[in-house]
């Protein structure tokens, strides 16, 4: 349905508050280094223009596309070339190339200062003084650090952020009320950002077909009572929403997401029995709730898949007539029967089935050729099951911190060329799979663990893509989306790696480590561990453990000393010497 003015259409659909918030997010995700005040000015100008178009859709420039309007606005930034360098060249292009150019310059790891949380009283004063600016600043700071954050979901986070301050700034103990809420929002926000980053990578690097396959599998697990046609419709709509958000079309994305939530709630009887509570909530909460809703119960009776997908005489005929529809039905039928499998496993099974049909439907006796296709699934199913079993046992034995350390060593030996901060960040997140998933019963472990690992390994892939240093990482990241985790799991120690020169400075610590939080102190120790492995990739577990134990004791001792700095200087030298001896450096 064509509208005379797209900007007026979206302004009316979304309302002024959401319109302004989404434009701010869009601009901050594109121009990540621009000061807050500059973005607010641009947003206000766009909003005023939108209002003139609402008043008269035929007014000058109101018929222009949103990309044209927003791109023109971004290209008015005076300091574009000095702040962003070659990104300024985007402004010489025409749409749609200009928008593609802006998208390509989004930076997953922007050089921005860490967000430091001010004192609670300071935050509450700022909140009361100017609530609107305070909340805009939140959107801006998150959006520029997470350029692929799912914009309509960020509105939901902002709503919760506002609610936390509204409640807690009136509480007797403001800090006790507010800090846990802010911690929860931060952790959920990081997780939400990483999950969305995988969706965008899936669409951008592997195409719409890959995303649709993922969505068919996930929605079929979630809505096993829904008909295939219903799931297909939801997949098409969901793909449109995420394509728009990943493409920077945030107004369209938020609008279409609201429409999808409306459709799901109007048709919940034919989708899922679990949607009732979600559908009673306001829009932002409703959409979030639907996205997180638990799997519905499986239909009471489902036959074996063998009849339709192996034994039927029409398998090759059905496949040839509409390959993707037939494979989609296979994936739907398999996924609705297997909420205990990860989505990536289901996609591997579907890929194996597709490969088998491609080969067998061209053979002399197709049925004889594909009759045993499900035997090929067995090793594919057992590999993640065994891996999860082994790693959960290791996690239960070691606890989260030491489990992270085991993964740090494992991954540093696999891909030692990767930067230390990236190895620490990714291995710490990989290690969180233990506390996140190992507590679940068997039937929920694999979907929890393997789909979470896909999200974390995608972080490694996008960070590595910015500065590629390892052919092995590039290979695992680009060959197959669903086989990334098995590809990384299969990597052995990189025998071609030339150990890093020993640098005592890397292992020099100061008294400031004593004032760090437990988490920051862990990161310091884990950074040292990665560096150790880079110096001595052949070091045994026992050697590394001994050095790390000495290091922990050294930090504890010096943090208790009266003259901390002297202790760190003197004992540090001894520690380095002892470590070199222990590792034979």
């Amino acid at each position: 349905d064509a509208h005379k003015s797209e900007v007026a259409h979206r302004f009316k659909d979304l309302g002024e508050e959401n319109f302004k918030a989404l434009v701010l997010i869009a601009f901050a995700q594109y121009l990540q280094q621009c000061p807050f005040e500059d973005h607010v000015k641009l947003v206000n100008e766009v909003t005023e223009f939108a209002k003139t178009c609402v008043a008269d859709e035929s007014a000058e420039n109101c018929d222009k596309s949103l990309h044209t309007l927003f791109g023109d606005k971004l290209c008015t930034v005076a300091t574009l070339r000095e702040t962003y360098g070659e990104m300024a060249d985007c402004c010489a292009k025409q749409e749609p190339e200009r928008n593609e150019c802006f998208l390509q310059h989004k930076d997953d790891n922007p050089n921005l200062p860490r967000l430091v949380r001010p004192e609670v009283d300071v935050m509450c004063t700022a909140f009361h003084d100017n609530e609107e600016t305070f909340l805009k600043k939140y959107l801006y700071e998150i959006a520029r650090r997470h350029p692929y954050f799912y914009a309509p979901e960020l509105l939901f986070f902002a709503k919760r952020y506002k609610a936390a301050f509204t409640e807690c700034c009136q509480a007797a103990d403001k800090a006790a009320c507010l800090l846990p809420k802010l911690d929860e929002l931060r952790d959920e926000g990081k997780a939400s950002s990483a999950k969305q980053r995988l969706k965008c990578a899936s669409l951008q690097k592997f195409g719409e077909r890959a995303f649709k396959a993922w969505a068919v599998a996930r929605l079929s697990q979630r809505f096993p009572k829904a008909e295939f046609a219903e799931v297909s419709k939801l997949v098409t709509d969901l793909t449109k929403v995420h394509t728009e958000c990943c493409h920077g079309d945030l107004l369209e994305c938020a609008d279409d997401r609201a429409d999808l939530a409306k459709y799901i709630c109007e048709n919940q009887d034919s989708i899922s029995s679990k949607l009732k509570e979600c559908c009673e909530k306001p829009l932002l909460e409703k959409s979030h709730c639907i996205a997180e809703v638990e799997n519905d119960e499986m239909p009471a009776d489902l036959p074996s898949l063998a009849a339709d997908f192996v034994e039927s005489k029409d398998v090759c005929k059905n496949y040839a007539e509409a390959k993707d529809v037939f494979l989609g039905m296979f994936l739907y039928e398999y996924a609705r029967r297997h909420p205990d499998y990860s989505v990536v496993l289901l996609l591997r099974l579907a890929k194996t089935y597709e490969t088998t049909l491609e080969k067998c439907c061209a053979a002399a006796d197709p049925h004889e050729c594909y009759a045993k296709v499900f035997d090929e699934f067995k090793p594919l199913v057992e590999e993640p099951q065994n891996l999860i079993k082994q790693n959960c046992e290791l996690f239960e034995q070691l606890g989260e911190y030491k489990f992270q350390n085991a993964l740090l060593v494992r991954y540093t030996k696999k891909v030692p060329q990767v930067s230390t901060p990236t190895l620490v960040e990714v291995s710490r997140n990989l290690g969180k799979v233990g506390s996140k998933c190992c507590k679940h019963p068997e039937a929920k472990r694999m979907p929890c663990a393997e789909d979470y690992l896909s999200v974390v390994l995608n972080q490694l892939c996008v960070l590595h893509e910015k500065t590629p240093v390892s052919d092995r990482v590039t290979k695992c990241c680009t060959e197959s989306l669903v086989n990334r985790r098995p590809c990384f799991s299969a990597l052995e120690v990189d025998e071609t790696y030339v150990p890093k020169e020993f640098n005592a400075e890397t292992f020099t610590f100061h008294a400031d480590i004593c004032t760090l939080s437990e988490k920051e102190r862990q990161i310091k120790k884990q950074t040292a561990l990665v560096e150790l492995v880079k110096h001595k990739p052949k070091a045994t577990k026992e050697q590394l453990k001994a050095v790390m134990d000495d290091f922990a004791a050294f930090v504890e001792k010096c943090c208790k000393a009266d003259d901390k700095e002297t202790c760190f200087a003197e004992e540090g030298k001894k520690l380095v010497a002892a470590s070199q001896a222990a590792l034979g450096l």
Partner: nanobody, 124 residues
Framework: EVQLVESGGGVVQPGGSLRLSCAAS????????MGWFRRAPGKEREFVAA????????YYADSVKGRFTISRDNSKNTVYLQMNSLRPEDTALYYC?????????????????WGQGTLVTVSS
């Protein structure tokens, strides 16, 4: 956690019949696909028959189609395998299995719980 105990095995002449039972405890079987598998001496374990959660769908190995019938009584938490026209090649240890989730009824990796087995010998 489901415990499965098979019974009803024994020695029977070719052409004879037997009815195997599988009694489940520890959980209700109505949420499980139930199957029978067998292992003949010196051979791999093979699929025999399976039945869907409510009993609406049954599935058989080609070698037993038309001779064996699988059924279930969810109220008694029991699954049955009626075996007619028995042949010497049906001689095997018969296992009952329960699968919480199952797409391919014939695949042993889709089953979570297994009984110890009951021996069926077909001999003249």
């Amino acid at each position: 956690e489901v415990q499965l105990v098979e019974s009803g095995g024994g020695v029977v002449q070719p052409g004879g019949s037997l009815r195997l039972s599988c009694a489940a405890s520890g959980s209700t079987i109505s949420s499980y696909v139930m199957g029978w598998f067998r292992r003949a001496p010196g051979k791999e374990r093979e699929f025999v028959a399976a039945i869907s959660r409510s009993g609406g769908y049954t599935y058989y190995a080609d070698s037993v189609k038309g001779r064996f019938t699988i059924s279930r009584d969810n109220s008694k938490n029991t699954v049955y395998l009626q075996m007619n026209s028995l042949r010497p090649e049906d001689t095997a240890l018969y296992y009952c299995a329960a699968g919480r989730y199952s797409a391919w009824y014939s695949q042993s990796y889709e089953y979570d719980y297994w009984g110890q087995g009951t021996l069926v010998t077909v001999s003249s």
